[in-house]
């Protein structure tokens, strides 16, 4: 049978020629007479054997991290007859280490991040070294890490490289720390290979800066003129933090809220002071307020870091602006009676400047003819006014500070003309009707009716009567129904054609007004010769009528 | 786990010198126990071992190709490659790089492969 | 150099059936340098089994190796629909390492 023991071969060996050991058949007799053969990988070219002897050599140097066994087979062979002295057999070379390589970091590069603050002991990484030799053979691939850098913040586990915390940290006062490890193998015996990487340690920042004004006093102004929700300033806090635990809340303390109000622009973190109600220099021409800040997120166990907001004084200084003159009302509304003679009083207007020089006013009106104003702001009639032609007057009185005539007002002014009475009532239109010359006494002929141009504060009440001359020659009669109208009727029987062709009647017609006015109106009557039905035969009024294009009936 | 991924170009000029690149993920090539390796694939036909590489740089190539091959490794960007002289239509084939396992042989894993043409 | 035959050169079955692949050595290998390899249309090889009889990460139970010296075998027990590809052995126990021909296994 075959004889031989492990093989082993140290790696790296600088020789050309290094003996591993023998192989050997329990035949041989050492008298030469066996030829050893070598087959397989690398036989021939990385290892040899001695085929007299069974002696094999490796001729080449082995690096056992790049192969660590090889199976190679074996033969013998009697050289006297060929054959196979022992079945060929497969044996393997291990190649044995030696501590030829240093760890390697192989995960580089390493970068942590850990809450600032954070506690000792607190895991912030894990660095993780290879050694290519064998972790079988003796201590050549036992690692100890150390610290080169990052005393006193960090400390390394020896055996496994976990990085932990070994004393708080401020980000306001450093937010990265590079820390340097090291690598030793053969546990760090002498003749150790170390190798070393850098961990950038960065400290995410926490909540334990609270917000704090850097003025504890800002100066602002606000024109009076401006409207609500104007923008008069900003103020800012800082903050030490980033991100959102820089983030901020400005606010007014309660007391300080009424005209102003402060608003946080969250891109900027300032506070935005905004005008919450118009303000009058003339009232009050400056505000003291306290404006306060915090920041947005405080966990809850941060809090003890926000204990106190911090506070700063505001004040506002109010500029004063030109302002127009203000009249004592938003409008006027004046009556007059009307044919009150030129220059009568109407009434009177007045505005003031409220600034404090207090400038004179000059007052005009707009676009009238018809009314006077002076500088006292009383109003007069330049002319007579006629009721029944503008019962009232929309104007516009315009108020001019003096010293400063760019700053004007203008408010309405209505002015209502009063009537009195002094239009008489009339026809209500023009009255021309006939009477037939058999026509008996009492027939009615004609109603007719009134108008007043006059306003009535009661209803108008006309009153009827023939004029004196009409009422002695009593050919026609009236009756006054009461009700603003009135009837004439015949007051004799037979009428003729050709004696009197026309009467004209003298109508007078009173108002109720006080002094009561009356007119005269004509009424015309003309004779016609009428048939026995009524119908008219002949009658110069139906021709008369007729050419005028006038109704009969 | 490791993949890799060969890249190259797809078409290469008779009598120029075919050139491609390995890249290994999800692993160091830097480790031993290890060959980063070539192979090749006719059209049509069986697979042909081109050579390998140990990250250290040892190289082992197939005699047939041996004249022509050149593979290399570059641990930085753990990456390795093949350049293929003087190549003509018979080195028109599919190329793969795989790993293979330094004390026993085997190929695991495999890149997808690319197929290059050598054609004027 | 050492030539791996494969034979049959094309093995026609039926899912469900047992298959049997041979890879005969020109010279001894060792068992321990012997793997066996199985390729789809279009994609890269897959190593099934190392040392002969070992099987592959995540490879199915259905596939086993045998062999040694110069006569190697891989058996499928059981045929899959997603079995019928080309299947390679190689050898790694003398330079240059080398492939066989390969055997198609197809639907029949």
């Known amino acids: 049978g075959w004889v031989w023991n492990q093989f082993f071969v140290p790696e790296e060996m600088n020789t050309t020629s290094h003996h591993i050991g023998q192989l050997r058949s329990d035949l041989d007799n050492g008298n030469n007479s066996f030829q050893y053969k070598l087959l397989g990988a690398g036989a021939g070219s990385t290892f040899i054997i001695d085929e007299r002897t069974g002696d094999i050599y490796a001729i080449q140097k082995l690096d056992r991290e790049e192969r660590s066994l090889y199976i190679l087979r074996a033969q013998v062979i009697d050289i006297a007859t060929g054959r196979a002295v022992e079945p060929e057999s497969e044996f393997v070379i291990k190649v044995s280490d030696i501590n030829d390589n240093e760890p390697k970091f192989l995960d580089e590069p390493y970068e942590a991040i850990v809450p600032e603050m954070s506690p000792e002991g607190t895991l912030v990484i894990q660095v993780t070294a290879s050694d290519a030799d064998d972790p079988s053979s003796g201590n050549n691939a036992r690692l100890l890490y150390s610290l080169l850098q990052g005393q006193p913040y960090f400390s390394v586990e020896p055996t496994t490289g976990v990085i932990r915390i070994s004393s708080k940290m401020d980000r306001e006062l450093q937010d990265e720390y590079w820390v340097i490890i090291q690598a030793k193998d053969m546990i760090g015996q002498p003749g150790a290979l170390s190798g070393t990487t850098s961990v950038l340690i960065k400290l995410s920042d926490v909540n334990d800066n609270k917000p704090i004004f850097k003025e504890s006093l800002y100066r602002l102004t606000v024109s009076e003129s401006a409207p609500t929700g104007t923008s008069i300033g900003t103020i800012m806090a800082y903050d030490n933090d980033i991100g959102e635990n820089a983030e901020m809340d400005y606010s007014i303390e309660e007391d300080d809220s009424q005209t102003f109000d402060i608003i946080t622009n969250h891109e900027t973190q300032e506070g935005i002071v905004i005008l919450k109600k118009k303000v009058d220099f003339e009232h009050q021409n400056h505000y003291g307020i306290r404006a306060k800040v915090k920041n947005h997120h405080v966990p809850e166990q941060l809090m003890k870091y926000h204990t106190e907001a911090s506070t700063t004084f505001i004040k506002i200084q109010v500029e004063d602006v030109d302002e127009p003159p203000l009249f004592l009302l938003p409008y006027y509304v004046f009556e007059v009676f009307e044919e009150t003679p030129q220059g009568s009083f109407v009434g009177v207007v007045s505005a003031t400047d409220p600034d404090n020089r207090k400038s004179p006013i000059r007052y005009s009106i707009t676009r009238s003819k018809v009314f006077n104003i002076n500088d006292n702001g009383t109003i007069t009639t330049s002319n007579s006014l006629d009721r029944e032609i503008s019962a009232w007057y929309n104007l516009s009185i315009t108020a001019t500070e003096k010293y400063n005539i760019e700053q004007i007002s203008s408010i309405p002014l209505y002015v209502q003309v009063l009537n009195i009475n002094d239009h008489a009532p009339e026809f209500s239109q023009y009255y021309e009707t006939y009477v037939c010359e058999n026509a008996g006494s009492g027939q009615v002929i004609q109603t007719i009716s009134a108008v007043d141009r006059d306003e009535s504060i009661e209803e108008h009440h006309f009153y009827f009567n023939l004029s004196v001359e009409d009422t002695n020659n009593s050919s026609f009669t009236i009756i006054d129904n009461q009700d603003n109208t009135a009837v004439i009727l015949t007051n004799r029987t037979g009428f003729n054609l050709q004696e009197e062709p026309v009467f004209y009647i003298s109508i007078l017609i009173a108002d109720n007004g006080i002094p009561s006015l009356t007119s005269t109106n004509t009424l015309t009557i003309h004779v016609c010769d009428c048939g026995d039905s009524g119908s008219t035969q002949t009658c110069q009024y139906q021709e008369l009528v007729l050419s005028m294009g006038f109704k009969t009936e | 786990q490791v993949q890799l991924q060969e890249s190259g170009p797809g078409l290469v000029k008779p009598s120029q010198t075919l050139s491609l690149t390995c890249t290994v993920s999800g692993g160091s090539i830097s480790r031993g126990g290890y060959y980063w390796s070539w192979i090749r694939q006719h059209p049509g036909k069986g697979l042909e071992w081109i050579g390998y590489?140990?990250?250290?740089?040892?190289?082992y190539y197939n005699p047939s190709l041996k004249s022509r091959v050149t593979i290399s490794v570059d641990t930085s960007k753990n990456q390795f490659s093949l350049k293929l002289s003087s190549v003509t239509a018979a080195d028109t084939a599919v190329y793969y790089c795989a790993r293979v396992n330094s004390n026993y042989g085997w190929f695991d894993p495999w890149g997808q492969g690319t197929l290059v043409t050598v054609s004027s | 150099e050492i030539v791996l035959t494969q034979f049959p050169g094309t093995l026609s079955l039926s899912p469900g059936e047992r298959a049997t692949l041979s890879c005969r050595a020109s010279?001894?290998?060792?068992?321990?340098?012997l793997a066996w390899y199985q390729q789809k249309p279009g994609q890269a090889p897959r190593l099934l089994i190392y040392g002969a009889s070992s099987r592959a990460t995540g490879i199915p139970d259905r596939f086993s190796g045998s062999g040694s010296g110069t006569d190697f075998t891989l058996t499928i027990s059981r045929l899959e629909p997603e079995d019928f590809a080309v299947y390679y052995c190689?050898?790694?126990?003398?330079?240059?390492?080398?492939f066989g021909g390969g055997t198609k296994l197809e639907i029949k």
């Open positions: 010279q001894s290998v060792s068992s321990s340098y």
């Open positions: 590489i140990f990250y250290r740089g040892r190289t």
């Open positions: 190689q050898q790694y126990g003398s330079s240059p390492l080398t």
